[in-house]
Amino acid sequence: PASLAGCYSAPRRAPLWTCLLLCAALRTLLASPSNEVNLLDSRTVMGDLGWIAFPKNGWEEIGEVDENYAPIHTYQVCKVMEQNQNNWLLTSWISNEGASRIFIELKFTLRDCNSLPGGLGTCKETFNMYYFESDDQNGRNIKENQYIKIDTIAADESFTELDLGDRVMKLNTEVRDVGPLSKKGFYLAFQDVGACIALVSVRVYYKKCPSVVRHLAVFPDTITGADSSQLLEVSGSCVNHSVTDEPPKMHCSAEGEWLVPIGKCMCKAGYEEKNGTCQVCRPGFFKASPHIQSCGKCPPHSYTHEEASTSCVCEKDYFRRESDPPTMACTRPPSAPRNAISNVNETSVFLEWIPPADTGGRKDVSYYIACKKCNSHAGVCEECGGHVRYLPRQSGLKNTSVMMVDLLAHTNYTFEIEAVNGVSDLSPGARQYVSVNVTTNQAAPSPVTNVKKGKIAKNSISLSWQEPDRPNGIILEYEIKYFEKDQETSYTIIKSKETTITAEGLKPASVYVFQIRARTAAGYGVFSRRFEFETTPVFAASSDQSQIP
């Protein structure tokens, strides 16, 4: 077989049809897609391509320039009248840059044999494309039979003399792929066997999956695999200030597309995602965990003056338990319980109160009862000791009442009802409690039984009553507890030395419940039964006394 090595063919003046054709065809030089990497693009080579034509009178280069006076490398051959044509055009060595599968894009024109007079027997409408792999950049001196055929290239659109006259250019684009490649580079060869061809451009490229940031993971430029159906698994690396539970991976398809993402990165605590990067949380904002999407404002009663905060600092006199989540407001101990009242029954005392006005912002409020036994003469108090029993318990009380039993008779006691919550033990501040002084007695006054209503107005009710049947001593005072009906937790206490009182500041046309008890030196008796009275409407006249049975 003939050798393909030969000398460069000198550029010659091309026939008019070729010039017209090429100058128009080459106006549209399109940029390559981002997932294609050019190994050779004849349109962008400024100097000599260094291609070889063999024999010398076969393929020839046309020296043209585009509108920017850049050279256009075009090869043509048109030996349609002569038999047994075997014209070869060899490229210079092309590095495959590590790609194992490459693509060849040819742009060419081809003359319709039917439009050529007298050449029907010898005219062809196809040409052949070959390749030869080589690690050697100077390995063009090879035999025809060593080239591997890629394909026979035919035109989708051929042109006639008429097209030429109308300057209608029919530029064909054909793409073929070759692979797998195993050497550092390769040569391409184009074989003409008797066609009328102008090879306008040759672009050789490989496909890659371009570097991308997806789910805060950076995936590098990845050359596609040799197999057209192959998916390459690629590991991503997390962007700055991000972390992952499951290492991020994606698959690079043969077409240069990223597919099937697995895993993701998340901005670490103190950082949030913005525009594909992890940005620091600014002062006043925090992010406690990578699994939280964005930085949030510090919760109530907390602050941070740092960037990249993972939690906020509690304000003065506010606290956070270790078990409190960082998104929870800082809280403080509750204020003291209110309106504590006691009920003595021989050596037992029943205490009742209403919750503190300020719970400190927590739901876990409970109560602790401190018991002190006091010497009435010396005014000294001491701890009650272990003999006193608390029902249901002394500490951790959830209800607002407690019973103390097994107290000593005729003894002065001070009970301190302290409200506590989940941060009380973190606070160095004073305990918040209400005190109740009680004197035990074996015979506290019996209940008040006989209550009469006096003048009733729209905003007030006057009451009178008789001493208890069994006062069990000198009545020192009476305690009147009243509340709007069905509002029992919000009651008012009035103390009176007389057996009459007027409750002021009431709502018109509202029912109020009254209970009265007496106190002697021995302590309070139990409350009377409930008595209900109704204030008058806004425009009604006052009513007067009638005994309540």
Partner: antibody, heavy 120, light 111 residues
Framework: EVQLVESGGGLVQPGGSLKLSCAAS????????IHWVRQAPGKGLEWVAY????????YYADTVKGRFTISRDNSKNTLYLQMNSLRSEDTAMYYC?????????????WGQGTLVTVSS | DIVMTQSPGSLAVSLGERATINCKAS??????????MNWYQQKPGKAPKLLIY???NLESGIPDRFSGSGSGTDFTLTISRLEEEDAASYYC?????????FGQGTKLEIK
């Protein structure tokens, strides 16, 4: 009671150095960001620098960047401003001011200031 | 840098009257729904005092005749009924981004 007391001011020649201090009391110093703000004689306020409680966040005004260094010693409840390559335009009353806790934070407590005079 | 421009440079208002000071930022000082704008009062020979933070929040201990409003780039400090002790210089300051710039100040005098 929250208190900030500046010290270290005085007369210094152009090109010279000076280190200002700000002693803090009455609050948990280590959790508060502190600013330096200055005021040239007869002029308005100019923000100078900021340091967060843990010294992880530091900002400077362009006019002092590269010449001034803000720092703090939380064990001593003290803030510092190291001033190098001083210029006549650095002459001012220098105040330290605490970043507040009510969001978005203002400068809620200020010291009485220390006077720095840069003159030959 | 964000430039803060106060207007007017000075003003004289009668006792009991309303005083209004404006501050314009060269770009928005809002972030995540909050305006990072503070107002300070300074009397001669004294340190500045925080009046308003976050454009409209009154600092504790400040009389409620002081109020602030605005968002984005335009802000106003209003003193509803001027009192003798309100004669001072007033400064706006943005704390949205570093450097935390102040306005040039407005001197308020009693007419």
């Amino acid at each position: 009671e929250v208190q900030l007391v500046e010290s270290g001011g005085g007369l210094v020649q152009p090109g010279g150095s000076l280190k200002l201090s700000c002693a803090a009391s009455g609050f948990t110093f280590s959790t508060f960001g502190i600013h330096w703000v200055r005021q040239a004689p007869g002029k308005g306020l100019e923000w100078v620098a900021y340091i967060s409680g843990a010294s992880t966040t530091i900002y400077y005004a362009d006019t002092v960047k590269g010449r001034f260094t803000i720092s703090r010693d939380n064990s001593k409840n003290t803030l510092y401003l190291q001033m190098n390559s001083l210029r006549s335009e650095d002459t001012a009353m220098y105040y330290c001011a605490r970043y507040g806790t009510s969001f978005p934070y203002g400068l809620d407590y200020w010291g009485q200031g220390t006077l720095v005079t840069v003159s030959s | 840098d964000i430039v803060m421009t106060q207007s007017p440079g000075s003003l004289a208002v009668s006792l009991g009257e309303r005083a209004t000071i404006n501050c314009k930022a060269s770009q928005s000082v809002d972030y995540d729904g909050d305006s990072y704008m503070n107002w300070y009062q300074q009397k001669p020979g004294k340190a500045p005092k925080l009046l308003i933070y976050g454009a409209s929040n009154l600092e504790s201990g400040i009389p409620d005749r002081f109020s602030g409003s605005g968002s984005g780039t335009d802000f106003t400090l209003t003193i509803s009924r001027l009192e003798e002790e309100d004669a001072a210089s007033y400064y706006c300051q943005q704390s949205n981004e570093d450097p935390f710039t102040f306005g040039q100040g407005t001197k308020l005098e009693i007419k």
